[in-house]
């Protein structure tokens, strides 16, 4: 997995008028890291993990950069001509990556009302756009504006690429992010599903990195994919992840089933707790 820094900026317009506020989210290695979500941007670390990476400092630099990016995007939205009545959004996602071989990748993507219409490889300066006519129209509109704006010259895009990588390297120097491994906490719960059946749920939380194997086994043999329901692997706000897997089994056969967990080369099995049903529910998780 490469190290990555991802900026997600969103600005809104209402009945053709660009709103003053904007939302900026920054993800570091896929984790929520910084956020600006008020009229006046103030970069806020997302959890203790982000604070540890940034250290004992103010986030003036991040606030300044994110505010500037927000203003740029608001100007861009103002130049999109086909805005109709109601609420519209323009989103810019900028990603830079540093791979294990030290090679880098940088890209920028624009979305209008949630639909991708323009992408740029910030290293090769190559633009790409979807085939739909709406996307093509929007893309031409935005590209023309960016060309006109002296701030958006080739130098600017090179700077965006370089700045993103510079920030990523700065964050990585903290050492908090570097290839750490945090093992999951695993717990198994049971709940009544229907007559003679119970639903058993295996939850893994607090783990990093996000790659994990979690599955139910009967007498040591994995249950088929379609007899299990998996939750998404989601950030839990602490710089770690959480997920779950559930299946339905016959009451009385609990001891035959185990939850198998594998993470970063470590593995463990977790039995279904015996005794009374803990939670009453009649459907999946």
């Amino acid at each position: 997995e490469p190290h990555s820094l991802r900026y997600n900026l969103t600005v809104l317009s209402w009945d053709g008028s660009v709103q003053s506020g904007f939302l900026t989210e920054v993800h570091l290695d896929g984790q929520p890291f910084l956020r600006c979500d008020r009229q006046k941007c103030r970069a806020k670390p997302q959890g203790q993990w982000a604070e540890d990476v940034l250290g004992n400092k103010t986030w003036d630099r991040e606030t300044r950069d994110l505010t500037g990016n927000g203003k740029d995007l608001r100007m861009t939205l103002a130049h999109i001509k086909d805005q109709k009545e109601g609420l519209h959004s323009l989103q810019e996602i900028r990603v830079c990556e540093i791979h294990e071989d030290n090679s880098t990748r940088s890209s920028q993507h624009f979305y209008y009302d949630g639909e991708l219409f323009l992408s740029q490889n910030l290293e090769t300066k190559e633009w790409t756009m979807p085939q739909s006519s709406r996307a093509q129209t929007l893309a031409m509109n935005v590209r023309n504006f960016l060309k006109e704006d002296a701030m958006k010259t080739k130098t600017h895009y090179h700077a965006m690429h370089a700045d993103c990588l510079q920030e990523l390297r700065r964050y990585l120097k903290s050492g908090v992010v570097l290839r750490r491994t945090v093992p999951p906490m695993v717990n198994v719960t049971r709940s009544e599903a229907s007559e003679g059946n119970i639903t058993v749920t295996c939850r893994a939380s607090g783990f990093y990195p996000w790659n994990i194997t979690l599955s139910w086994r009967q007498d040591g043999v994995s249950l088929s994919h379609d007899t299990q329901q998996w939750g998404d692997v989601l950030p839990d706000g602490n710089g770690t992840y959480q997920t779950w897997v559930a299946t339905r089994i016959c009451q009385g056969e609990e001891q035959r089933f185990t939850c198998y967990m594998e993470h970063s080369g470590n593995h463990s099995t977790h039995p279904v707790p015996s005794g009374k049903v803990l939670v009453l529910q009649s459907h999946w998780q």
Partner: antibody, heavy 122, light 106 residues
Framework: EVQLVESGGGLVQPGGSMRLSCGAS????????MNWVRQAPGKGLEWISY????????YYADSVKGRFTISRDNAKNSLYLQMNSLRDEDTAVYYC???????????????WGQGTMVTVSS | DIQMTQSPSSLSASVGDRVTITCRAS??????LNWYQQKPGKVPKLLIY???TLQSGVPSRFSGSGSGTDFTLTISSLQPEDFATYYC????????FGGGTKVEIK
């Protein structure tokens, strides 16, 4: 006594079909996962199919996928293997085997039938 | 699919010898490994499950070890009734047997 007894083997021509049965006694068949394993003359063991107690997890070896079908009837304490498009290389002794239910098991087969011989030849 | 490779494919030993058979998986299978013994004309018999747990009724001279990709079956002091073919089997991803190791009298 815990027992598995296979039946239905015999001689069949290439391209033909055959259905093997495995009758279980001495244990609660409906609670156990079951398998078919075969052994060609003078060769090693080859696992070919698995079915769990509720028939909602079924696996096949690549060598028989699409040609063989495993099934079970818990009311009759029976396991079945429907074999279609048989080939010469399917000639073997076919065993049914029970997956142990011991705590901490790792898919081990604790009870085996005596086997039934299937010969595919023209 | 996971391949299981046993070595050696055959070995000659004498009564009282310490015998070691290895089984290697083509990818990590955790401890989802079992060992069987099969005598000529007989059905296979489960010896060890979960890589190292002795099945009830199996003599303590049999032991298993290993985790991940490399596993070992050891017979500490070979007895006359131990001359047979031994198979490993994994259940980490569906199920597969190793090719077998024939233990013969020297």
């Amino acid at each position: 006594e815990v027992q598995l007894v296979e039946s239905g083997g015999g001689l069949v021509q290439p391209g033909g079909s055959m259905r093997l049965s495995c009758g279980a006694s001495g244990f609660t068949f409906s609670s156990y996962s079951m398998n078919w394993v075969r052994q060609a003359p003078g060769k090693g063991l080859e696992w070919i199919s698995y079915i769990n107690s509720r028939s909602n997890t079924i696996y096949y070896a690549d060598s028989v996928k699409g040609r063989f079908t495993i099934s079970r009837d818990n009311a009759k304490n029976s396991l079945y293997l429907q074999m279609n498009s048989l080939r010469d290389e399917d000639t073997a002794v076919y065993y049914c085997a029970r997956v142990s239910a011991i705590t901490g098991n790792t898919g081990a087969f604790d009870i085996w039938g005596q086997g039934t011989m299937v010969t595919v030849s023209s | 699919d996971i391949q299981m490779t046993q070595s050696p494919s055959s070995l000659s030993a004498s009564v009282g010898d310490r015998v070691t058979i290895t089984c290697r998986a083509s990818q990590s299978i955790s401890s989802y490994l079992n060992w069987y013994q099969q005598k000529p004309g007989k059905v296979p018999k489960l010896l060890i499950y979960a890589a190292s747990t002795l099945q009830s009724g199996v003599p303590s001279r049999f032991s298993g070890s290993g985790s991940g990709t490399d596993f070992t079956l050891t017979i500490s002091s070979l007895q006359p009734e131990d001359f047979a073919t031994y198979y490993c089997q994994q259940s980490y991803s569906t199920l597969t047997f190793g090719g077998g190791t024939k233990v013969e009298i020297k």
